[in-house]
Interface confidence: low
């Protein structure tokens, strides 16, 4: 399937609007500090060039690879050295090294200001004045903050963003209409970014075998009526799509994703009865819908797994003949029977089964050796079940904010070397598992909770890799993808940690505290809590609760005072002294 001009091929396949959007996303994810206007200029130049290639595929430079064309364009940015430092050295390289160099410099935590939402009237005016620029700005701002955001999905978010403004800027109460929609898009966008980051980490750090295993388990849960061969085909195609997007090959990724959606909709009968409503939708919505589709009903007559995978005398023969296929079939069969298990648990079970066969198929009596293999699964299944049960009980008892605080204390004691902002961000997100999953019926709790925790802990791993400070974190992040969460759960208080010296500055607060939003106030308090634990890692729950209650009372008192700043100046040192005494 070779084309004289790759850029013309993708332009024709994707259409001008999607082509321009994806190129803007690609450039914004690579050069995260560049101003918007610079990116728009580059995108327009690439688009004009693509059009000349569509008109004549033999025109000069039209036969160049997309990496060559895009890299050449990025390297024309005048301020590359001043803005990006050593990233400018990438431009001295030839392809494919140059593109690899750009990828290496993607920053998961770019030093960019938080996005401030203007007044609704201001946004509506901007939307009406120049809709195209308004939407491009959205793509640019999201892409530069989330350099691994799944690009075709970002186009879907932009379409929803546009629809929200088109509807709400006409409404009687613009704010009431628009703000909840923007909040929903923001929260869904952050979740989508984090999920995709785990997919890219899985591919980049653990190889395509790890990603394929994840995909076999997840797609087998979603499509339990599909044959193994059908699931395998979908897994192969999905792996290609995500490998491309994680490599920055966004045009190919979007094109292949559209092809996969087309294939699924043309083959619904052999995949799932749940696809029908997705397949009537336009492309972006259809692909999103297929990715999020609910699990199909399990076939009623599925036989016991034991016959083929334990009782059969041919287990070792089948395993030896084609190990990965046999293990893939085992994972498929187990996953389609267990929508109530997390994908990570299913992968642990497959790993345990593989380890048993490796040991037993070399034994004198293999069948005798592996006869009890399913019994060995029990503790692996019970561990996440108990974890979910205990944490949901704690969440229901404490509520979200205090549950987050419990996790903050727990994780700071485990890995006190990690930076305070990272501990606050990760623990706040870990704490959101309660509201997200604990209200669900029993059969959906574990897949919701453990697979969400895997996404959040990946964020910790990604941030920690940029600035490694803890051997424990490195160990949990790198040794096994499927055992990351149990590895972190098993960590205890770090006895080797030397407590941080007390710094009064960390616990000095000012009147600006009173004008913060509720969320910002929580973050301030949680930052103080982490610093307290770093100072006194062996403090008891009761001691910490006492200090935090005093803190809340002190802030409330000063925010009600006539002279707020004077109150903070006077009461602050008293609070610090009382806290030190309470933790002594």
């Amino acid at each position: 399937d070779t084309h004289k001009s790759e850029v013309a091929h993708r332009f024709k396949d994707l259409g001008e609007e999607h082509f321009k959007g994806l190129v803007l996303v690609a450039f914004s994810q690579y050069l995260q500090q560049c101003p918007f206007e610079e990116h728009v200029k580059l995108v327009n130049e690439v688009t004009e060039f693509a059009k000349t290639c569509v008109a004549d595929e033999s025109a000069e430079n039209c036969d160049k690879s997309l990496h060559t064309l895009f890299g050449d364009k990025l390297c024309t940015v005048a301020t590359l050295r001043e803005t990006y430092g050593e990233m400018a050295d990438c431009c001295a390289k030839q392809e494919p090294e140059r593109n690899e160099c750009f990828l290496q410099h993607k920053d998961d935590n770019p030093n960019l200001p938080p996005l401030v939402r203007p007044e609704v009237d201001v946004m509506c005016t901007a939307f009406h004045d120049n809709e195209a620029t308004f939407l491009k700005k959205y793509l640019y701002e999201v892409a530069r903050r989330h350099p691994y955001f799944y690009a075709p999905e970002l186009l879907f978010f932009a379409a929803r963003y546009k629809a929200a403004f088109a509807e709400c800027c006409q409404a009687a109460d613009k704010a009431a209409c628009l703000l909840p929609k923007l909040d929903e898009l923001r929260d869904e966008g952050k979740a989508s970014s984090a999920k995709q980051r785990l997919k890219c980490a899985s591919l980049q750090k653990f190889g395509d075998r790890a990603f394929k295993a994840w995909a076999v388990a997840r797609l087998s849960q979603k499509f339990p009526k599909a044959e193994f061969a059908e699931v395998s085909k979908l897994v192969t195609d999905l792996t290609k799509v995500h490998t491309e997007c994680c490599h920055g090959d966004l045009l190919e990724c979007a094109d292949d994703r559209a092809d996969l959606a087309k294939y699924m909709c043309e083959n619904q009968d052999s995949i799932s009865s749940k696809l029908k409503e997705c397949c009537d939708k336009p492309l972006l919505e259809k692909s999103h819908c297929l990715a999020e589709v609910e699990n199909d009903e399990m076939p009623a007559d599925l036989p016991s797994l034991a016959a083929d995978y334990v009782e059969s005398k041919d287990v070792c023969k089948n395993y030896a003949e084609a190990k990965d296929v046999f293990l893939g079939m085992f994972l498929y069969e187990y996953a389609r029977r267990h929508p109530d298990y997390s994908v990570m648990l299913l992968l642990r079970l497959a790993k345990a089964y593989e380890a048993t066969l490796e040991k037993c198929c070399a034994a004198a009596d293999p069948h005798e050796c592996y006869a009890k293999v399913f019994d060995e699964f029990q503790p692996l299944v019970e561990e996440p079940q108990n974890l979910v049960k205990q944490n949901c009980e704690l969440f229901e008892q404490l509520g979200e904010y205090k549950f987050q605080n419990a996790l903050l204390v727990r994780y700071t004691k485990k890995v006190p070397q990690v930076s305070t902002p990272t501990l606050v961000e990760v623990s706040r997100n870990l704490g959101k598992v309660g509201a997200k999953c604990c209200k669900l019926p029993e059969a959906k709790r574990m897949p919701c909770a453990e697979d969400y925790l895997s996404v959040v802990l990946n964020r910790l791993c990604v941030l920690h890799e940029k600035t490694p400070v803890s051997e424990k974190v490195t160990k949990c992040c790198t040794e096994s993808l499927v055992n990351r969460r149990p590895c972190f759960s098993a960590l205890e208080l770090d006895e080797a940690y030397v407590p941080k010296a007390f710094n009064a500055e960390t616990f000095t607060f000012h009147a600006d505290m009173c004008t913060l939003s509720e969320k910002e106030k929580q973050v301030k308090k949680q930052t103080a809590l982490v610093e307290l634990v770093k100072h006194k890692p062996k403090a008891t729950k009761e001691q910490l609760k006492g200090v935090m209650d005093n803190f809340a009372a002190f802030v409330e008192k000063c925010c009600k005072a006539d002279d707020k700043e004077a109150c903070f100046a006077e009461e602050g040192p008293k609070f610090v002294a009382a806290s030190q005494a309470a933790l002594a």
Epitope: E97, E100, L103, Q104, L203, Q204, F206, G207, R209, K212
Partner: nanobody, 116 residues
């Protein structure tokens, strides 16, 4: 299209040395950890060694530790395996693969035979 082409194998006497190379193309080599795995006649795949994307973190199976050295040249998109003090039990087809210890080979491999 992801391509991994292994080379450098051959017949060598016990105690001898070989250097295997793996030329990678079609993906962002610099951004990925890489591994060597091997398959002895009639056996399954056995992980040999891994190296992270930057090249500073290397891991080895107990059977080759101290004898084999994994390295990479990101500028040349190439992965290497220096094999010293070879033993007859090192006889296998050697494959390079994208990722860590669980990586799946996709190339043709290169045959290493250790025999007197």
């Amino acid at each position: 299209q992801v391509q991994l082409v292994e080379s450098g194998g051959g017949l060598v006497q016990p105690g001898g040395s070989l250097r295997l190379s793996c030329a990678a193309s079609g993906f962002t080599f610099r951004g990925f950890g890489m591994s060597w795995v091997r398959q002895a006649p009639g056996k399954g795949f056995e992980w040999v060694s891994s190296i992270n994307s930057g090249g500073e973190d290397t891991r080895y199976s107990d059977s080759v530790k101290g004898r084999f050295t994994i390295s990479r040249d990101n500028a040349r998109n190439t992965l290497y395996l220096q094999m010293n003090s070879l033993k007859p039990e090192d006889t296998a087809v050697y494959y390079c693969a994208i990722g860590g210890a669980g990586a799946t080979p996709s190339g043709q491999g290169t045959q290493v035979t250790v025999s007197s």
